[in-house]
């Protein structure tokens, strides 16, 4: 369906934060867009977070979401927080043009996010 571009690889910060841009090529003049981040592990796909926004307005995730984001035109800047090493995996950006019709859907190829847990600080003797 729609073309959706996202980076192939992102390294999370030592604080467990990963950011990437999801860009889509809109075939029409959508006013309502839904962005979903999916995590794929083998044949399992789980929804990480999702937000619907009106073009020109800010992207709003639920209060308890681990995602935040901003939008500019056909670009969405996504940030995922609270990541740990076990969360390393393929994160897929899904974009849906919800309104007005026609409905369009696009799936990115996925961003491999690598998360390395920080080493615990050794005890210090002074």
């Amino acid at each position: 369906a729609m073309h959706v571009a996202q980076p192939a690889v992102v390294l999370a910060s030592s604080r467990g934060i990963a950011s990437f841009v999801c860009e889509y090529a809109s075939p029409g003049k959508a006013t309502e867009v839904r962005v979903t981040v999916l995590r794929q592990a083998d044949s399992q796909v789980t929804e990480v977070c999702a937000a619907t926004y009106m073009m020109g307005n800010e992207l709003t995730f639920l209060d308890d979401s681990i995602c935040t984001g901003t939008s500019s035109g056909n670009q969405v800047n996504l940030t995922i927080q609270g990541l740990r090493a076990m969360d390393t995996g393929l994160y897929i950006c899904k974009v849906e043009l919800m309104y007005p019709p026609p409905y369009y859907l696009g799936i990115g190829n996925g961003t491999q996010i690598y998360v390395i847990d920080p080493e615990p600080c050794p005890d210090s003797d002074f």
């Epitope: 029409g28 026609p102 409905y103």
Partner: antibody, heavy 115, light 108 residues
Framework: EVQLVESGGGLVQPGRSLRLSCTAS????????MNWVRQAPGKGLEWVGQ??????????YYSDSVKGRFTISRDDSKSIVYLQMNSLKTEDTAVYYC??????WGQGTTVTVSS | DIQMTQSPSSLSASVGDRVTITCGAS??????LNWYQQKPGKSPKLLIY???NLADGVPSRFSGSGSGTDFTLTISSLQPEDVATYYC??????????FGGGTKVEIK
Amino acid sequence: EVQLVESGGGLVQPGRSLRLSCTASGFTFSDNWMNWVRQAPGKGLEWVGQIRNKPYNYETYYSDSVKGRFTISRDDSKSIVYLQMNSLKTEDTAVYYCTGGMDYWGQGTTVTVSS
Amino acid sequence: DIQMTQSPSSLSASVGDRVTITCGASEIIYGALNWYQQKPGKSPKLLIYGATNLADGVPSRFSGSGSGTDFTLTISSLQPEDVATYYCQKILSPPPWTFGGGTKVEIK
């Protein structure tokens, strides 16, 4: 009111050609990827092909069963999409629907391929 | 190409029954699935888009669910006007945008 009106169907002999037209109104034609879907008598729906719009360079896609024989084109200035069908086979006999996105459907036009 | 398998191929249920139709994809399609209703002698009509979204004007007794490879269309309380054939369709690129084989729903 959204309308898609197909025309050009009829009886044609195997090996011959036919061109179907679909005239759209009531929506922004140029924003839509247009599809052709067919339904053989007593059978299910079969996706035939698609033409995308200007932002997607009018890319076309076809099902394996019609690839190389059928061609989809569009005229955004007239809000018309065409299905050029060459080298027709008896198994192409069906009702042909055009769709806007997959949201809007025409009433269909019948193509019968028979000698 | 991704194959779409719909089941059952036909069913008969009573008015007021809950009816469930399933559609399976041979690969993950990330919710890129539509459901259509086709009444006898009529053109198909979009019911559900993107696996879960109800199309305009469609009664709320229809709902869609599923993700990954397995999807479901549910009619919570079957009505006489729901007699039709229902089709799922994969709408994920690259095409073909394959349809399932259809499920014919009749009233007992």
